[in-house]
């Protein structure tokens, strides 16, 4: 049952070479194991709310309580970590908001670049200056939570110094981490202060602690590893984009749609239009026109630029993205002001995210 009548046909088909699509991450809720977590579904005017975890329906059980717009998880465990979504079903439409839950002691994150030669991490001390262990490069330790696809290689680093030169050992979930604890073992590169695990599997999930010590003291740092088994998902659009805009007659304006998709997406910019003086077809559905779509002759499909706008250009602009898995769309409004009024970026946005995973 199509929800609109297209003035120009649309298909699933992406026609242009891919670019690198990326978005900001969904909101993350962190809880320590054993804690209770309560999340409110941030959607308005919901007649019925349904919840999913990792794309699968979530129902109440002895630890999961669903009351109205609230999801409560009692006595959280690492298994509760994942991508959650609440969908608000209304009489005329539905909307989805998604968020991450991480049940872990770790709370910060950063980048995870490869070692070069690692020489900067191996600090030699003047033999007279006795010193307890200390971290030499905390920037490389900021990313505590590592969510890694299965089969990837993981590297945890604890660059340290001290005099005498400290030793490093690793714990998994608070206990000595032995080679036989995982198939294929692991590598410790002492001069890089690193632990390397190749081809990670779900059983590698857990807390990894480096303990760096010498006769003058001991310091430690814990990383949390989550091994993610994923299925391909439909496009996700960055919340808040495209954003409402206003300009004067004759002005220029740009709408931006930021896309994440792990299958090549097809992007369309669509606007409500009139046909034969009517905004709606005989079936009662609105007429829509495809203004731009990703294709061979279309550069940077994530941006819709309008030049020398007229009052007729005012209205709702829809960014619709599809891949072979599914679709997502969000919209924004363009207000065209008379020449004497100064334009301004509108504060409120009416973008309504439509994504699941």
């Amino acid at each position: 049952r199509p929800s609109f009548s297209l003035v120009e046909d649309t298909t699933l088909e992406p026609e242009e070479p891919p670019t690198k699509y990326q978005i900001s991450q969904p909101e993350v809720y962190v809880a320590a194991p054993g804690e209770s977590l309560e999340v409110r579904c941030l959607l308005k005017d919901a007649a019925v709310i349904s919840w999913t975890k990792d794309g699968v329906h979530l129902g109440p059980n002895n630890r999961t309580v669903l009351i109205g717009e609230y999801l409560q998880i009692k006595g959280a465990t690492p298994r509760d970590s994942g991508l959650y979504a609440c969908t608000a079903s209304r009489t005329v439409d539905s909307e989805t908001w998604y968020f991450m839950v991480n049940v872990t002691d770790a709370i910060s994150s950063g980048d995870d670049e490869d070692d070069t030669d690692g020489a900067e991490d191996f600090v030699s001390e003047n033999s007279n200056n006795k010193r307890a262990p200390y971290w030499t490069n905390t920037e490389k330790m900021e990313k505590r939570l590592h969510a890694v696809p299965a089969a990837n290689t993981v590297k945890f680093r604890c660059p340290a110094g001290g005099n005498p030169m400290p030793t490093m050992r690793w714990l998994k979930n608070g206990k000595e981490f032995k080679q036989e604890h995982r198939i294929g073992g692991y590598k410790v590169r002492n001069q890089h202060w690193s632990l390397i695990m190749e081809s990670v599997v779900p059983s590698d999930k857990g807390n990894y602690t480096c303990v760096v010590e010498n006769e003058y003291g001991s310091i430690n740092h814990t990383y949390h590893l989550d091994v993610v088994e994923r299925s391909p998902h439909r496009p996700i659009l960055q919340a808040g984009l495209p954003a409402n805009a206003s300009t004067v007659v004759g002005g220029d304006v740009e709408f931006v749609c930021k896309v994440y998709s792990d299958a090549q997406p097809h992007i369309q910019w669509i606007k409500h239009v009139e046909k034969n003086g009517s905004k709606y077809g005989p079936d009662g559905l609105p007429y829509l026109k495809v203004l731009k779509h990703s294709g061979i002759n279309s550069s940077n499909a994530e941006v819709l630029a309008l030049f020398n706008v007229t009052e007729a250009d005012a209205g709702e602009y829809i960014c619709k993205v599809s891949n072979y898995i599914g679709q997502a769309n969000q919209s924004a409004w363009l207000t065209v002001l008379p020449k004497q009024q100064a334009p301004g970026r509108e504060k409120e946005i009416t973008a309504s995210p439509d994504y699941l995973e």
Epitope: E15, D262, A263, S322, Y324, Q327
Partner: antibody, heavy 113, light 107 residues
Framework: QVQLVQSGAEVKKPGASVKVSCKAS????????IHWVKQAPGQGLEWMGA????????SYNQRFKVRATLTADTSTSTVYMELSSLRSEDTAVYYC??????WGQGTTVTVSS | DIQMTQSPSSLSASVGDRVTITCGAS??????LNWYQQKPGKAPKLLIY???NLADGVPSRFSGSGSGTDYTLTISSLQPEDVATYYC?????????FGGGTKVEIK
């Protein structure tokens, strides 16, 4: 868990139509394309088309566009594939699949006079 | 339409062998390629998506590689339960064409 359950086997005469159903459960039905794939006896796989239940958007393989019709009923989380003007070469197993990740068990359609 | 050419059409190997199946596309598909395993009388099962990503629940002995027009599915150590027909599929553009299939048997 995600499940796609298809309707049972059909035997049809040439020129008739057949309507195969695919009932989805365990996920938000409207959020994924449902694809249909044909597999003739002893042959490979052939994509027929897809439908997006949320808005009814469809896309067809040109080879099937004239005779195949895909529809979705969001109230029952069911997708239908109707094939008209049947001929003997339509004898095949027809699969529905949620974004090619989860597949139905297949429906055998036999066209014979 | 994008044509997908698989080779070999069939192969026989011993348990523990490394098995390689190749798939060629008639034009650049930018890594938009899936691999499936189909056992007799059963529906296809997704093994690899996006040319290199292992689907949920698939043993790590399966791996995918390639880019542009040339792609490979590798089974690092063939197991008896891997006897099946394997298909590649273009998921860049419609129609989402499949390769002709590779039948894998145990010697």
């Amino acid at each position: 868990q995600v499940q796609l359950v298809q309707s049972g086997a059909e035997v049809k005469k040439p020129g008739a139509s057949v309507k195969v159903s695919c009932k989805a459960s365990g996920y938000i039905f409207r959020n994924y394309y449902i694809h249909w794939v044909k597999q003739a006896p002893g042959q490979g796989l052939e994509w027929m088309g897809a439908i997006y239940p949320d808005n009814g958007d469809t896309s067809y393989n040109q080879r099937f566009k004239v005779r195949a019709t895909l529809t979705a009923d969001t109230s029952t989380s069911t997708v239908y594939m109707e094939l008209s003007s049947l001929r003997s070469e339509d004898t095949a197993v027809y699969y529905c699949a949620r974004a090619f990740t989860y597949w139905g068990q297949g429906t055998t359609v036999t066209v014979s006079s | 339409d994008i044509q997908m050419t698989q080779s070999p059409s069939s192969l026989s190997a011993s348990v523990g062998d490394r098995v390689t199946i190749t798939c060629g596309a008639s034009e650049n598909i930018y890594g938009a390629l899936n691999w499936y395993q189909q056992k007799p009388g059963k529906a296809p099962k997704l093994l690899i998506y996006g040319a290199t990503n292992l689907a949920d629940g698939v043993p790590s002995r399966f791996s995918g590689s390639g880019s542009g027009t040339d792609y490979t599915l590798t089974i690092s150590s063939l197991q008896p339960e891997d006897v099946a027909t394997y298909y590649c599929q273009n998921v860049l553009s419609t129609p989402y064409t499949f390769g002709g299939g590779t039948k894998v048997e145990i010697k």
